[in-house]
Structures are given as C-alpha cells and as structure tokens.
C-alpha cells in the first residue's frame, strides 16, 4: 500500500536511509509531502518484520518503486493505491 498523507505534524524522520529494501520485505509505504511543519518530503516504510524506516526520497530505488506503484494504481481501478488524508 502506498499512501500520501497531508498532516500538520512536524518532521517524523530522525534519520533517513538509502539502503535498498526488496519489495517482498515491504508492507506499506507512506509519503509525507514537504510543508505543514516539515521542510522536507518524508518517506516512511513499514517492513514485514515489524520494523520501520525512513527512506531518503532521493534514493533511486524508492523513486523507481513509487513510479511502478503509481502506474499500477492508475491502471487497477476502482481501488486506489494513493490515499490522501487532508485534516
């Protein structure tokens, strides 16, 4: 599941990693766009082993993965991959 959240919270990520995470290990991805208290875009990945990590949005592998998920979400209706939550 890929999610985009708009919140008024400050930055969530303490440290970001560029280390590749194979898709089979990923349970969920959340994208927090910059603004609303945090000056940078944040990407949070929940792994299937019950750990959680912030991924550097500039990491090539996460950009490629998000592009694949975007394409998949636009072609598999009616269930959207993006969930926009606007408080």
């Amino acid at each position: 599941v890929l999610e985009v959240y708009y919140t008024s919270l400050r930055c969530r990520c303490v440290q970001e990693s560029s280390v590749f995470i194979p898709r089979r290990f990923i349970d969920r991805i959340q994208i927090l766009p910059r603004g609303n208290g945090c000056p940078r875009k944040e990407i949070i990945v929940w792994k299937k082993n019950k750990s959680i990590v912030c991924v550097d949005p500039q990491a090539e592998w996460i950009q490629r993965m998000m592009e694949v998920l975007r394409k998949r979400s636009s072609s598999t209706l009616p269930v959207p991959v993006f969930k926009r939550k606007i408080p």
């Epitope: 969530r12 990520c13 303490v14 440290q15 969920r28 944040e42 949070i44 929940w46 082993n49 019950k50 750990s51 959680i52 912030c54």
Partner: antibody, heavy 122, light 107 residues
C-alpha cells in the same frame, strides 16, 4: 489516555504454567502498527524482553525461552496474554506488559503497565 | 543475539553533578537505542529514543549520544528526582535486548 494492567497468579509452584493477562485501554490491537510486549524483571535485577504480539497476529519471542512461551491476544476484549510453561524459581520476577506503536518516530514500549509480582516457590 | 553491556552498574553522585552512563552494543544497532528511567517501585519510562532524542516531557538536562558502538546517557546537572535505575534497550532487531541497568544514587 493509554493504560495497561497486568493480572495473574501471585504465586505458583515449580513445573506449573504461568498465565498472565494484560488488559489495556486507549488503543486497539486491531489498529495497524499496534503491538503489545511482555518484559520481566527479577527483583533488583535488569529487564528481560520476553515476547511481542502485533495487530496482524505476528509474534516474536525471546529465543532463550521460545519453547516455554506463548503470546496471544483477544482484540475485541482489549487483552493480550502470556503463558510460560514449566516455571521454576528463576522465573520469579515482576512481569510487565507494554505497548508498542509502529509509527515514526518509533518508540517501542512507550507505555507500561504497573507490573505484577510473580513468585515461583514450592 | 545482540548483547548490550551497560556500565557502571551503580553510580553515586551529588546534586548538580554531571553524570554519564554507557551501553556498548556487540553488533551494529545504528541509532535504534532507547534509555528508560525506572524510579523505585515504578515502571520504566522512556527518556531518550533513537539514541539522542528527548522523549516528551523529559527535562533538557538529559541527553543521549553515540560514539561508534558506545551509547551514552548524560545528565548535565543532577537533581534529586533523577534518582532511579536506567536501562538501555536496542531495538534494531529481534530479540530486543536490554542492558543490565545502572542504579543512580544521590550522595
């Protein structure tokens, strides 16, 4: 607010099975990212992590005790359970349950119960 | 399993002193380390998470740092309410492991 409370027998005999219940409020184990863990502390000593159970029924155990531990939950009753088989004197300790929420920033065991003192004695 | 070696086991200091306690990890745990404070007869409570971040409501005299595999908790000016046991916890990987604890006493 988040609260947790442990319950179970205060005393039991060697070779018996210890059954502990954690009753909690302020969160639900049906919510994505929620978990409950069990930790114990012998009197005057350090903490020892025992087990975790997560919203999706994923379970993790301390390998040194894995053959004796069973963690489970009743989501609708807001309860988590821990069973320890074949107890002996070294299992005498205060047992705590604690919440973990898999969010960023991740702070496992951010809320704890008051603890329950368990004595194993013949 | 990752071993967490905590020192000293006990520490006696005067009010206003600067004190430091340490945990050493046997394997790489990144920044995934928490310090818990446990006051006498009470449950543990997080004071520092992700090695150096102050938990909500914790006074700014508490701080955490890392040097390689050594993780430190420092209290810059000791107050009487800081008398407690302190435990480190690594949560990089299962099984989660605690240090053996540091008992902080006031002289």
């Amino acid at each position: 607010q988040v609260t947790l409370k442990e319950s179970g027998p205060g005393i039991l005999q060697p070779s018996q099975t210890l059954s502990l219940t954690c009753t909690f409020s302020g969160f639900s184990l049906s919510t994505y990212g929620m978990g409950v863990g069990w930790i114990r502390q012998p009197s005057g000593k350090g903490l020892e992590w025992l087990a975790n159970i997560w919203w999706d029924d994923d379970k993790y155990y301390n390998p040194s005790l894995i053959n004796r531990l069973t963690i489970s939950k009743n989501t609708s009753n807001n309860q988590a359970f821990l069973k320890i088989t074949n107890v002996d004197a070294p299992d005498t300790a205060t047992y705590y349950c604690a919440r973990s929420e898999l969010v960023m920033p991740y702070v496992p065991f951010d809320f704890w119960g008051q603890g329950i003192m368990v004595t194993v004695s013949s | 399993d990752i071993q967490m070696t905590q020192s000293p086991s006990s520490l006696s200091a005067s009010l206003g002193d600067r004190i430091t306690m340490t945990c050493q990890a046997s394997q790489d745990i990144g920044i995934e380390l928490i310090w818990f404070q446990q006051k006498p007869g009470k449950s543990p409570w997080p004071v520092i998470y992700y090695t150096a971040n102050l938990a909500s409501g914790v006074p700014s005299r508490f701080s955490g740092s890392r040097s390689g595999s050594h993780y430190s908790l420092t209290i810059s000016s000791l107050e009487s309410e800081d008398m407690a046991d302190y435990h480190c916890l690594q949560y990089k990987q299962y099984p989660f492991t605690f240090g053996s604890g540091t008992k902080l006493e006031i002289k």
